[in-house]
């Protein structure tokens, strides 16, 4: 903590301006009034403060606003945002997308994924739902940030907004997030024709159930292998060799180069070897001819 001292009369601060860069840490602490700082936050980012000086300014704001900063201050944090922890941000109530844009710009190029995720979460809470304007802001200023939201937050996305989401915005989404987004996407794109539907739904397919994947295999879609490998393991395992062949089309060739990676590896282990041989890929590890497959999970469920 910064040592408390009294402010020398000649150092008294009446304006937040460039003269402050010559103040030592203890002088800033003693001479800058927190309320003045809050009122003139818009000036702070134009002044080349050191990180140590910014620490002092943050400390003053924390004392003034122990329950969390007001949005008028948050909007003008500028590089002071780099000093915020997720715990600090959790106290905020943010509703303005201009505030979000300003802070996303500041965070670019810095390792602040946890802070940014928390900030986005606060914006969604503050606005009541993940509306189109918020999604547009995220896709424009923070590609991939959509996936930093929890499944609970993502559940507030109306299906009408899904069309604004681009494939690259979903690259870092995990299975639980795609489980939430997929049904919304299915609803949003339901009136599209086959090939157009597939192009749109493709980034969301990591949340698709087996029956939807089977249905796609009947539609001549030629799913690329990267998309196939993002499917849920439970959705892939029940597929037959013929269904996978139809689903992937020419891309089925890629199973050979990815045969050691899940879900390809797990799927191979469940197929009959002579069925795998029809793919013309030299895939090994299937169930040998003449072996009987017992599904013990059924017996366990009955007992």
């Amino acid at each position: 903590d910064v040592e408390r001292t009294t402010c020398p009369p000649e150092k008294e601060v009446h304006e937040i301006d460039e003269s402050l860069i010559f103040y030592k840490k203890r002088e800033l602490e003693a001479c800058v009034d927190a309320a003045l700082l809050a009122a003139q936050m818009d000036r702070v980012d134009a002044i080349p403060f050191t990180y140590e000086q910014l620490d002092v300014l943050k400390h003053k704001l924390d004392e003034l606003y122990p329950q969390g900063y007001p949005e008028s201050v948050i909007r003008h944090l500028g590089h002071l945002f780099l000093k915020m922890s997720p715990e600090d941000i959790r106290k905020w109530n943010v509703t303005s997308l201009e505030t979000l844009k300003a802070l996303l710009k500041v965070s670019k190029g810095h390792e602040m994924s946890a802070q940014v995720a928390t900030l986005i979460d606060r914006v969604v809470v503050g606005r009541g739902q993940l509306d189109k304007d918020t999604v547009d802001t995220l896709t424009a200023f923070c590609p991939g940030c959509l996936c930093s939201l929890s499944p609970e937050r993502l559940s507030s996305v109306p299906p009408s907004v899904i069309g604004a989401v681009r494939p690259q915005d979903l690259d870092t989404c995990g299975p639980r997030q795609l489980d939430v987004l997929y049904p919304k996407a299915r609803l949003a794109f339901q009136n599209m024709s086959g090939s157009e539907y597939f192009v749109k739904i493709r980034p969301f397919l990591g949340g698709a159930p087996t029956e939807d994947v089977k249905a796609l295999s009947q539609q001549n879609v030629s799913m690329d292998l990267a998309t196939f490998m993002k499917l849920r393991r439970e959705a892939v395992l029940p597929l037959t060799v013929a269904e996978v062949q139809k689903l992937l089309g020419p891309h089925v060739e890629g199973l050979k180069v990815e045969e050691q990676h899940s879900p390809v590896r797990d799927w191979i282990l469940k197929q009959r070897q002579d069925d795998l041989d029809t793919l013309g890929l030299g895939l090994q590890g299937g169930i040998p001819n003449g072996y009987l497959i017992l599904d013990l999970s059924v017996r366990e469920a009955l007992s």
Epitope: L225, A226, V252, E253, K256, L279, G280
Partner: antibody, heavy 117, light 113 residues
Framework: EVQLVQSGAEVKKPGASVKVSCKAS????????MHWVRQAPGQGLEWMGN????????YYNERFMSRVTMTVDKSTSTAYMELSSLRSEDTAVYYC??????????WGQGTLVTVSS | DIVMTQSPDSLAVSLGERATINCKSS????????????LAWYQQKPGQSPTLLIY???TRESGVPDRFSGSGSGTDFTLTISSLQAEDVAVYYC?????????FGGGTKVEIK
């Protein structure tokens, strides 16, 4: 040693068809897909399609969809590519290439097809 | 279709010097599950068929001299010849095998200065 030996050069008239063969040796023919790629004089490479020699399933670049047919004869380990309704812009060297997974690991020597009236 | 853009179109390099060829794809070639980039590099010497140099963006095909190396991920890739030899005079092509139709770059002609 993997070898892909293609049939000889052909001269065809516009509107005719050409069938190029590619005889494979030195590996298990049904374990690797065969691709066909063409190269117009002084130009780059263009992927035409691929075929699964085990099942005979073939997939074509949409640009050639209505004119190309790829087949295999497992008994002779030979792949074929037939292109119909030839036009002057089909003048090119046609290559067969054995897949190494997805990439093209081994290439035939190429077959020059000249389309001229 | 995925568009592959190679640069430069041609390159003149002194013997023993480094040659660098760039390849840019219009969309990512990264399989984020396996972390494999579906990009290959081929060499085509005058009057010959192409031969495979590199696959998965950076894996050298067996028998390819170690002066050839590939790097990059996502949409930006590079083929480097660390010390150009006379026998490296050729046209070099990148190719994506992420999504059909598999497409090639326009080629880069490498000559000796």
């Amino acid at each position: 040693e993997v070898q892909l030996v293609q049939s000889g050069a052909e001269v065809k008239k516009p509107g005719a068809s050409v069938k190029v063969s590619c005889k494979a040796s030195g590996y298990t023919f049904t374990n690797y897909w065969m691709h066909w790629v063409r190269q117009a004089p002084g130009q780059g490479l263009e992927w035409m399609g691929n075929i699964n020699p085990s099942s005979g399933d073939s997939y074509y670049n949409e640009r050639f969809m209505s004119r190309v047919t790829m087949t295999v004869d497992k008994s002779t380990s030979t792949a074929y590519m037939e292109l119909s309704s030839l036009r002057s812009e089909d003048t090119a060297v046609y290559y067969c290439a054995r897949s190494g997974g997805l990439w093209l690991a081994f290439w035939g020597q190429g077959t020059l097809v000249t389309v001229s009236s | 279709d995925i568009v592959m853009t190679q640069s430069p179109d041609s390159l003149a390099v002194s013997l023993g010097e480094r040659a660098t060829i760039n390849c840019k794809s219009s969309q990512t070639l990264l399989n984020s599950v396996s972390q494999n980039n579906y990009l290959a590099w081929y060499q085509q010497k005058p009057g010959q068929s192409p031969t495979l140099l590199i696959y998965f963006a950076s894996t050298r095909e067996s028998g390819v001299p170690d002066r050839f190396s590939g790097s990059g991920s996502g949409t930006d890739f590079t083929l480097t010849i660390s010390s150009l030899q006379a026998e490296d005079v050729a046209v070099y092509y990148c190719q994506q095998h992420y999504r059909t139709p598999y497409t090639f770059g326009g080629g880069t002609k490498v000559e000796i200065k």
